[in-house]
Amino acid sequence: IWELKKDVYVVELDWYPDAPGEMVVLTCDTPEEDGITWTLDQSSEVLGSGKTLTIQVKEFGDAGQYTCHKGGEVLSHSLLLLHKKEDGIWSTDILKDQKEPKNKTFLRCEAKNYSGRFTCWWLTTISTDLTFSVKSSRGSSDPQGVTCGAATLSAERVRGDNKEYEYSVECQEDSACPAAEESLPIEVMVDAVHKLKYENYTSSFFIRDIIKPDPPKNLQLKPLKNSRQVEVSWEYPDTWSTPHSYFSLTFCVQVQGKSKREKKDRVFTDKTSATVICRKNASISVRAQDRYYSSSWSEWASVPCS
Amino acid sequence: RNLPVATPDPGMFPCLHHSQNLLRAVSNMLQKARQTLEFYPCTSEEIDHEDITKDKTSTVEACLPLELTKNESCLNSRETSFITNGSCLASRKTSFMMALCLSSIYEDLKMYQVEFKTMNAKLLMDPKRQIFLDQNMLAVIDELMQALNFNSETVPQKSSLEEPDFYKTKIKLCILLHAFRIRAVTIDRVMSYLNAS
């Protein structure tokens, strides 16, 4: 058993049929010694008396809010949560496996630049009685500070019969140099509590590996005289690290119709303009990627050919 | 310490091309190592990230773009003395700061060159003959060093009398290649910045 936060404790259980469970001793936080009774949740049934209460925790029915009283007055609470371990593996029931970039990916993180600011998100089908808390650091043995905000519900989607909820959190490394060469990864730890179930999820990464620039901005077209060719120009996204001559981007320019299976014109360039062939009912799209370290491409920025 | 804006004329910076070749060569070599050593811990997640130049050179700090010198997190108190002549400078306007930067890059390359050559000698003794260093990568390191053209003491190649542990050597190769790729990215950024300034 360990303390998650004040008056909230996590009991780690090996989860299999007829498992013996864990013996837990609760102590009432009071100077009083006599006349103390214990109850669980809303029940008025007295579970025991005395300053300490010893319980055998085997299942979710044994978890919950234990309260010690004296003469009708509440003295203190202890909330017991369960953390299940099945076949030596901690349960991952609360969050959905996003399976990208690989299986067992519960947390996904992205950074728009090298400033040390990043966003992580996760998915669940659970809509109520759900709380998250996020901690992060650079390295684990001698951790350096990363400050994370509160996790918030950022999107709701319908997937077949199920509703899916996306939560996200923003974090900022306390003293980040955009030009630094990372040797210790960022560690992100998410505590998830659903009713009386506790789970924790972690992710470890270098900012350089989670870079995904914003799309290029200010796309403009200039038709070339006596030609089907069009000059398309754009600018670096505002959120990208500066100076741009140091943090350079490379671009992919594509002309395509509505369907992905249609013909296309595609060219890669390090410049902020390119010449392409425009077709009727097609769009010109441009996306960006770090020129020197190939992490993710940005989303497309698009303008119609016409 | 930082790079000033007064730098060579645009397009006249002879090291940019070499640095691009360097990044390409080390990336290819790392990819080859990951594929060939698929049953060894050779991915970014599996290896320890070591920097053989730590406390010996200070490339990131010496080559910091002027715009980042206002960022206190980028300013490191490490001071290293460097030799200050070199052909990539290509302009009299080039300052002492830029010489420090290019000199630091040269020292990095020299250190990695020695490590890679020592390692290759060991890998050539491996009866499995599983992996060797790409001669192109070694040639590209040499070309960039020649373009930088700093006079510096030659570092003797480390020779080892004991029987090499090939498993450890291959793990070390992965560690070195990952670190060198990161440094090659920095070098490419620096050269691009200098070329544009």
Partner: antibody
Framework: QVQLVQSGAEVKKPGSSVKVSCKAS????????LHWVRQAPGQGLEWMGW????????EYAPKFQGRVTITADESTSTAYMELSSLRSEDTAVYAC???????????WGQGTLVTVSS | DIVMTQSPLSLPVTPGEPASISCRAS??????LHWYQQKPGQAARLLIA???QSISGVPSRFSGSGSGTDFTLTISSLQPEDFATYYC?????????FGQGTKVEIK
């Protein structure tokens, strides 16, 4: 299986024109750009131009502009390349090639030898 | 026009040995570079697109690298069916242009 089958070899007199055909099978004809590339004996490959069979749009290499005409007939899934004012240096193997991507070629025809000789 | 220069023009190789062909562009073309194989009397075959992207159905012994002005096609272990002429082609701008070809011959 996508295939491009070209017409047979031709012998032409200087100053005349030649029209080479390229019949596509497999896949929808108008879903692909179609290009013509030539190779003179002992020389490298030379791109001549492309056509979008969907709308008849064409673009030609400046070197051939005014002498080459690329057309397409959707009903027969056939593209044509006509080269006029032939000279001896136009002796070459002419190949058609296609792709959904405009700027490179994933399927090639077997080539048609055009000999220009007086 | 962008001029593509291949080297060497002739490459004698022992079967089973690796082979590398170089292609240089007269100006930077990013990764807009493609490789083809051609055998006498046969249609050309696309091997690599955009400098390093492998093509479905092409053996994994063929790989490409490079960006900017310098590109390489590598055949890790030459098989008897690989003896042919190889061409690079730039797609950075029109007109599309090719290298002069490299003939890989049996040593």
């Amino acid at each position: 299986q996508v295939q491009l089958v070209q017409s047979g070899a031709e012998v032409k007199k200087p100053g005349s024109s030649v029209k080479v055909s390229c019949k596509a099978s497999g896949g929808t004809f108008s879903d692909y750009y179609l290009h013509w590339v030539r190779q003179a004996p002992g020389q490298g490959l030379e791109w001549m131009g492309w056509i979008d069979p969907e709308n008849g749009d064409t673009e030609y290499a400046p070197k051939f502009q005014g002498r080459v005409t690329i057309t397409a007939d959707e009903s027969t899934s056939t593209a044509y390349m006509e080269l006029s004012s032939l000279r001896s240096e136009d002796t070459a193997v002419y190949a058609c090639a296609r792709n959904k991507e405009l700027r490179y070629f994933d399927v090639w025809g077997q080539g048609t030898l055009v000999t220009v000789s007086s | 026009d962008i001029v593509m220069t291949q080297s060497p023009l002739s490459l004698p190789v022992t079967p089973g040995e690796p082979a590398s062909i170089s292609c240089r562009a007269s100006q930077s073309i990013s990764i807009n570079l493609h490789w083809y194989q051609q055998k006498p009397g046969q249609a050309a075959r696309l091997l690599i697109a955009f400098a390093s992207q492998s093509i479905s159905g092409v053996p994994s012994r063929f790989s490409g690298s490079g960006s900017g002005t310098d590109f390489t096609l590598t055949i890790s272990s030459l098989q008897p069916e690989d003896f042919a002429t190889y061409y690079c082609q730039q797609s950075n701008s029109f007109p599309l242009t090719f290298g002069q070809g490299t003939k890989v011959e049996i040593k």
